[in-house]
Structures are given as C-alpha cells and as structure tokens.
C-alpha cells in the first residue's frame, strides 16, 4: 500500500458520516485537472471510506488522488486535515 493511499484513507476515516456524504457531493463537481474524468455518481454515493479511497486511487492515481482529496477537504473548511494529508503524502 502506498503512503498517499494510506493518507487518503486516514483522512476519509476521520470524517463524520455527514462530512463523508458532503465530501462525495463536492467530489462530483470539484474542478479537475485537464485529462481527468469524474467518478460516476451512482458508484460514488454508496461507498464507505475504504471503497472511496480505492476508487480515488484507481481513478486518479495516488499523487493526484491525494491532491484532489485535499482540495475537497479545503472546500469543506477542513484545511487542517487537508494539510495533514498533504504532509503525510510528501514525507
């Protein structure tokens, strides 16, 4: 398991159920870097933190998956968690 994947999982597992739901909704409309597609809505909404981590990494690979996760956390006002995720990724 990669360091970035672990960091993404750790962040998502620290969200409340309500925050995880909000994370998924924001992920559906977050601005994406050129060349990346969006995870289909139907697949996304039923996922738990572990499934969502796997989907983020398979869709976006570890580096961009971690960056994207951090940005969605920032959009949710969770800047500290986003910073911790990025720090763990860059260790």
């Amino acid at each position: 398991m990669g360091r970035a994947r672990d960091a993404i999982l750790d962040a998502l597992e620290n969200l409340t159920a309500e925050e995880l739901k909000k994370f998924k909704l924001k992920l559906l409309s977050v601005p994406l870097a050129a060349g990346y597609g969006r995870i289909p809505r139907g697949a996304l909404l039923s996922m738990d933190a572990l499934d969502l981590t796997d989907k983020l990494v398979s869709f976006y690979l570890e580096t961009y998956g971690a960056e994207l996760t951090a940005n969605v956390l920032r959009d949710m006002g969770l800047q500290e968690m986003a910073g911790q995720l990025q720090a763990a990724t860059h260790q």
Epitope: K26, S29, V30, P31, N71, R74, D75, M76, G77, Q79, E80, G83
Partner: antibody, heavy 114, light 107 residues
C-alpha cells in the same frame, strides 16, 4: 440573497467582555477590521456540527459558539482593550468550492472605552 | 501563517482606465484566493473566488487570474462605482489571511 443579521453597535469598558451574535448557516467566520485597516480572520465555526478553527492570535480572547436551534453563531470577546475597538463582521462560506466568504453581515461596531 | 501582500497600496485613476491589482502569497496557495470589494462604511463583498471565478452578479469587467503565489485582479474599464478598497484573501490554510488592501481613488 442571504442576509446575515448582526446588531449594530456595542459599547464596553476595558477589561470587560462582549458577546456578538450572527444569524447564519454553514461555516460562519468572524473577521475584525480596525478603522482604516485591513481584515483579520478571528476564526470560524460550523453551525451543523460545532467544529471550530481559531487564529492563534485571537484564541485567548475569542470563544466561538453556536445555538443550532436559532441558527445563531456567537463570538465572546473577553478582557477587551482599546486595541479591540473595531468592526466585527460575520461571514458565511456557501459557495461549493474554494471556501470564499460570500455572504457578509453588516458588522457590529465595538467601542472599548471607560 | 501565509502572508498575502497586496500592491500597490493605492491607485489614482480616471474613469474608463484599465486597472491591475496584484496580490502575492508567501507560499503556494493553489487557486484558493478570493478578491473582495469594500466601499466606505460597508461590508466587504465577494467579487472573485478560486482565483478566477466571477461571483454571481459581478460585472464582467472584473477578471481574476493567477495561481500558486501570484494573483491579479483586472478591472477592464473602471466605473465610478468601482472606487473602493480591494482585499485579497487565501483559504488554502488556517489561519485564513487577507492582504492589507488596495484603495482605488479618483485622479
């Protein structure tokens, strides 16, 4: 257009406390502006779960709380000095991405004077 | 803390002029920069968020650009109602921070 409701003015004595209120929703920020100066972020509170973040500069003097039943955010400012005379704004972050402050209250002018 | 430096501090200009306001972050803040307009005795109002997204109802003469550490607010043809203070702010990291502001005045 969402309107954030704040009382207009507060006059308090040095060393005293004041509790400012703001009818709001979502993430509510508190921002200080001294006359003729820039904006300083005090902290924010999430009205749905009570999660708070503070600017360390204000942590000792500001306490952010929420009353969910009335959708009201509060900041209690304690041990006030003349340096705390300022307009205090509440602002919301409602835009889905990038967390800007898109709705602002009209501000409460706090004057600290004996 | 991330320091946001705005320049110039003030500008005197004529109606119809093109204006460029600059904001520099002390470290990379991605696109997490907003621009606010504040008129005397009024609350700030959001103009631009995410460095380049115009907020609802903001005239298209206001344009934001930049990323990472260097950001620009351009007003293509200044109107009398644009004379105000302009603040940039970052929402990338806590504490959220603002620049000291740029004041636009009539020449």
């Amino acid at each position: 257009q969402v309107q954030l409701q704040q009382p207009g003015t507060e006059l308090v004595k040095p060393g005293a406390s004041v509790k400012l209120s703001c009818r709001a929703s979502g993430w509510t920020h508190w921002v200080k502006q001294r006359p003729g100066q820039g904006l300083e972020w005090i902290g924010n509170i999430n009205l749905s779960n009570g999660r708070t973040n503070y600017n360390e500069k204000f942590r000792a003097m500001a306490t952010l709380t929420v009353d969910k039943s009335s959708s009201t955010a509060y900041t209690q400012l304690s041990s006030l000095t003349s340096e705390d005379s300022a307009v205090y704004y509440c602002a919301n972050s409602m835009v889905p991405h990038f967390f800007p402050m898109d709705y602002w209250g009209q501000g409460t002018s706090v004057t600290v004077s004996s | 803390n991330i320091v946001m430096t705005q320049y110039p501090k003030s500008m005197s200009l004529s109606i119809g002029e093109r204006v460029t306001l600059r904001c520099k972050a002390s470290e990379n803040v991605g696109s997490y920069v907003s621009w606010y307009q504040q008129k005397p005795e009024q609350s700030p109002k959001l103009l631009i968020y995410g460095a380049s997204n115009r907020y609802t109802g903001v005239p298209d003469r206001f344009t934001g650009s930049g990323s990472a550490t260097d950001f620009i607010l351009t007003i293509t043809s200044v109107q009398a109602e644009d004379l105000a203070d302009y603040h940039c702010g970052q929402s990338y990291n806590y504490p959220l921070t603002f620049g000291a502001g740029t004041k636009l005045e009539l020449k």
